[in-house]
């Protein structure tokens, strides 16, 4: 079995203010099992933008159901995008620990440029 | 850390109904599949059915799709299976597990409800 | 439906020795390069627990004296070393269709 790459196939996305964008991230393999996580940043100063396991995250929606058989679509939507959620988004996969998660592999990123509405 | 912890142990007549529920903590409830698994005394496991939560899509083992129903609270992340026109050879120890990878496994278990049907 | 039928019932080891319990499926649970079979330990008065999760890949936590191997209809759980704890009920579950569990194999000390 070939080991798990995370893909982020968007280097960058740009999104209008106050639209919708769509991160892109697929799981090469279902092996490891465990959650996915979206943070904006990397390094121990990273936002957590999106916890597959755990958390509520109201602008967020994923574009797959997570819970259909071997689903590795990991996209997700964010909503309402402001020039503040402008950055680099990283696609991280974990795998399932004992007792706690742990960090597996991270796509690339993707960075969102943030377009101001015409005034 | 995942929780499942389940509702107690009952004492049914023949004929009776049951409704063993399953309450969940550690995760997000609708992003994984709850299934429902029985024992009965000193035999093997016996797979009844199982639910997504996000939707209510459920799965029967064709043995129980006549007699048992499987539904949630997402308000209070609990899951429920009700068994219907209880015989003597329902008791068992009745399971929720959590399907952590979508694979329709079952990685983690609640300790389980002992039902007993007698007259 | 598919059936799972392990081998053998019963099984008793020395401690220190290799146990192997097998488990055949009525036909492939294999697709798309996955083997969808899972194997659970279960202690008396406990819950089952995850070991071994699509043929061949450990759960977190589980030594790694227990593995999993097979493809398609046949499939075994060896554990290299056997040690006291080791004692339990034995399961094999596909999933390449709704799930279904083998009988259970006793593993005891001899």
């Known amino acids: 079995e070939e080991e798990l790459q995370v893909i982020q196939p968007d280097k960058s996305v740009l999104v209008a203010a106050g639209e919708t964008a769509t991160l892109r991230c697929t799981a090469t393999s279902l092996i490891p099992v465990g959650p996915i996580q979206w943070f904006r940043g990397a390094g121990p100063g990273r936002e957590l933008i999106y916890n597959q396991k755990e958390g509520h995250f109201p602008r967020v929606t994923t574009v797959s159901d997570l819970t259909k058989r071997n689903n590795m679509d990991f996209s997700i939507r964010i909503g309402n995008i402001t020039p503040a959620d402008a950055g680099t988004y990283y696609c991280v996969k974990f795998r399932k620990g004992s007792p706690d998660d742990v960090e597996f592999k991270s796509g690339a990123g993707t960075e969102l440029s943030v377009r101001a509405k015409p005034s | 850390q995942v929780q499942l912890v389940q509702s107690g142990a009952e004492v049914k007549k023949p004929g009776a109904s049951v409704k063993v529920s399953c309450k969940a903590s550690?995760?997000?409830?609708?992003?994984?599949?709850i299934n429902w698994v029985r024992q009965a005394p000193g035999q093997g496991l016996e797979w009844i059915a199982m639910?997504?939560?996000?939707?209510?899509?459920?799965h029967y083992n064709q043995i129980f799709k006549d007699r048992a129903t499987l539904t949630t609270d997402t308000s209070t992340s609990t899951a429920y299976m009700e068994l219907r026109s209880l015989r003597s050879d329902d008791t068992a120890v009745y399971y929720c597990?959590?399907?952590?990878?979508?694979?329709?496994?079952?990685?983690?278990w609640g300790r389980g409800t002992l039902v007993t049907v007698s007259s | 439906d598919i059936v799972l039928t392990q081998s053998p019932d019963s099984l008793a080891v020395s401690l220190g020795e290799r146990a192997t319990i097998n488990c055949r499926a009525s036909?492939?649970?294999?697709?798309?390069?996955?083997?969808?079979i899972f194997w659970y330990q279960q202690k008396p008065g406990q819950p089952p627990k995850l070991l071994i999760y699509?043929?061949?890949n450990l759960d977190p936590g589980v030594p790694d004296r227990f593995s999993g191997s097979g493809s398609g209809t046949d499939f075994t759980l060896t554990i290299s070393s056997l040690q006291a704890e080791d004692v339990a009920v034995y399961y094999c579950?596909?999933?390449?269709?709704?799930?279904?569990f083998g009988q259970g194999t006793k593993l005891e000390i001899k």
């Open positions: 597990a959590m399907d952590y990878g979508s694979l329709y496994a079952m990685d983690y």
């Open positions: 550690g995760y997000t409830f609708t992003n994984y599949w």
């Open positions: 639910i997504d939560p996000s939707d209510s899509e459920t």
């Open positions: 036909k492939s649970v294999s697709s798309s390069g996955y083997n969808y």
């Open positions: 699509l043929a061949s």
């Open positions: 579950q596909h999933s390449r269709e709704l799930p279904t």
